[in-house]
Interface confidence: low
């Protein structure tokens, strides 16, 4: 699998992964004890036909061209979890692995 | 996890899974021995904020609102393989499980 990596200086218009630090304090999410911020990353960019297509299915739907199919969009194709320490609704402190919090790779699907 | 299922008569505008039969013969893909057609399905529809969001990450990126982030789009969130019999590039007959050929669920990511 392959995905492009970009930053805020990139001129790349195609589907790419960009750095993004999510700051829970800035959001006012005070129920999150740790981390106060983490590197989440995000996907942005255009999906030209066949570029960075993760699945053969994407190609097949393009071929079949059903009503309402909008073509692929730039979306996470690989994500990873982070461990978090937080208050749950009962004010208990929970330590747990929260899935799909970090974008590792972007692609067109 | 939850995803909407629709058909060609549905009036649903939100992100939904639609039936789609892929016909390899119609595409002229004569290197595929079996199946000649299969039910692939596809995703289509609008992703209003928070509707059918698969990942907390999607919500966080919306909160952080970085440059160029386009908002979530309707894309497969669960896929499954099919078994196929096909000729490879060396004209050998291969029987194998091809991943991510069928859309089982759609969501916004």
């Amino acid at each position: 699998d392959f995905g492009l990596d970009c930053d805020e200086h990139s001129t790349e218009s195609r589907c790419c992964r960009y750095p993004l630090t999510v700051d829970f304090e800035a959001f006012g999410w005070d129920w999150i004890i740790a981390p106060k911020r983490y590197k989440a990353n995000y996907c942005s960019g255009e999906c030209e036909f066949v570029f960075l297509q993760k699945y053969p299915h994407t190609h097949l739907v393009h071929q079949a061209n059903p009503r309402g199919s909008a073509g692929p969009c730039c979306t996470p194709t690989k994500m990873s979890p982070i461990n978090m320490l937080y208050f749950n609704g009962k004010e208990q402190i929970i330590y747990g692995k929260i899935p799909a919090m970090v974008v590792d790779r972007c692609g067109c699907s | 996890d939850f995803g909407l299922d629709c058909d060609e008569h549905s009036t649903e505008s939100r992100c939904c899974r639609y039936p789609l039969t892929v016909d390899f013969e119609a595409f002229g893909w004569d290197w595929i021995i079996a199946p000649k057609r299969y039910k692939a399905n596809y995703c289509s529809g609008e992703c209003e904020f928070v509707f059918l969001q698969k990942y907390p990450h999607t919500h966080l990126v919306h909160q952080a609102n970085p440059r160029g982030s386009a908002g979530p789009c309707c894309t497969p969130t669960k896929m499954s393989p099919i078994n196929m019999l096909y000729f490879n590039g060396k004209e050998q007959i291969i029987y194998g499980k091809i991943p991510a050929m069928v859309v089982d669920r759609c969501g916004c990511s």
């Epitope: 990596d5 970009c6 930053d7 805020e8 200086h9 992964r17 960009y18 750095p19 630090t21 700051d23 740790a34 981390p35 106060k36 911020r37 983490y38 590197k39 989440a40 990353n41 990873s80 982070i82 461990n83 978090m84 320490l85 919090m101 970090v102 | -």
Partner: antibody, heavy 122, light 110 residues
């Protein structure tokens, strides 16, 4: 006890090769980013490279091609293979573990070995 | 590649004084900054990560701040055991995980 222990340092001639080992104990090798950092006598810290959780390796531009990081999960050991050594490679070489900081594969290091001295001289 | 510049090179202060160390990045690194303390003959010790988060077991007199290109490590009340060299470090998890250290600031006790 959670620790990293480097070995394999010593005197080597210019143009020679050396393989450093970093034996880890008290934690699972493959669950953490591992890095190598060096420090020339009286100088600052210099990053060499890392091997991430998936086993992919990344190097400083100056180390690319000459230095290779690998790991053997069964031996709980990370390696640094150094080829075409030069006098300016003389340094203490540290093995370090990425921080388990609730976060995503950060490459700051919260556990370090004591270091092993490599001297390149004829 | 990002370049980290620390100032001053050396600092000599008395116990109890407030210490301010500076680290500047050649381009924006968001919050991706760590601080280390290294004493002679020892490996570095992580003090701060993500610009301001105190690492486990680090005394609360150490405080990190800043984002973007300008970062500061403050020791609110200098203790004799704080005599060491302090390094800032950034890491880039987007483009090939490049890691860069500053050249260090040596803190001496008068």
């Amino acid at each position: 006890e959670v620790q990293l222990v480097e070995s394999g340092g010593g005197l080597v001639q210019p143009g020679g090769s050396l393989r450093l080992s970093c034996a880890v104990s008290g934690f699972t090798l493959s669950h953490y980013v591992k890095g190598w950092v060096r420090q020339a006598p009286g100088k600052g810290l210099e990053w060499i490279g890392i091997i991430n959780i998936e086993g992919s390796t990344y190097y400083a531009s100056w180390a690319e091609g000459r230095f290779t990081i690998s790991r053997d999960n069964s031996k709980n050991t990370v390696y640094l293979q150094m080829n075409s050594l030069r006098a300016e490679d003389t340094a203490v070489y540290f093995c370090a573990r990425g921080h388990d900081n609730f976060g995503y594969s950060y490459h700051d290091f919260n556990l370090w070995g004591q270091g092993t001295l490599v001297t390149v001289s004829s | 590649a990002v370049v980290m510049t620390q100032s001053p090179a050396t600092l000599s202060l008395s116990p109890g004084e407030r210490v301010t160390l500076s680290c500047q990045a050649s381009e924006s690194i968001h919050h991706e900054l760590s601080w280390y303390q290294q004493k002679p003959g020892q490996p570095p010790k992580l003090l701060i990560y993500l610009a301001s988060t105190l690492a486990s077991g680090v005394p609360s007199r150490f405080k990190g701040s800043g984002s973007g290109t300008d970062f500061t490590l403050t020791i609110s009340s200098l203790q004799p055991e704080d005599a060491a060299t302090y390094y800032c470090q950034t890491y880039d998890g987007i483009s090939h995980y490049g890691v860069a250290f500053g050249q260090g600031t040596k803190v001496e006790i008068k």
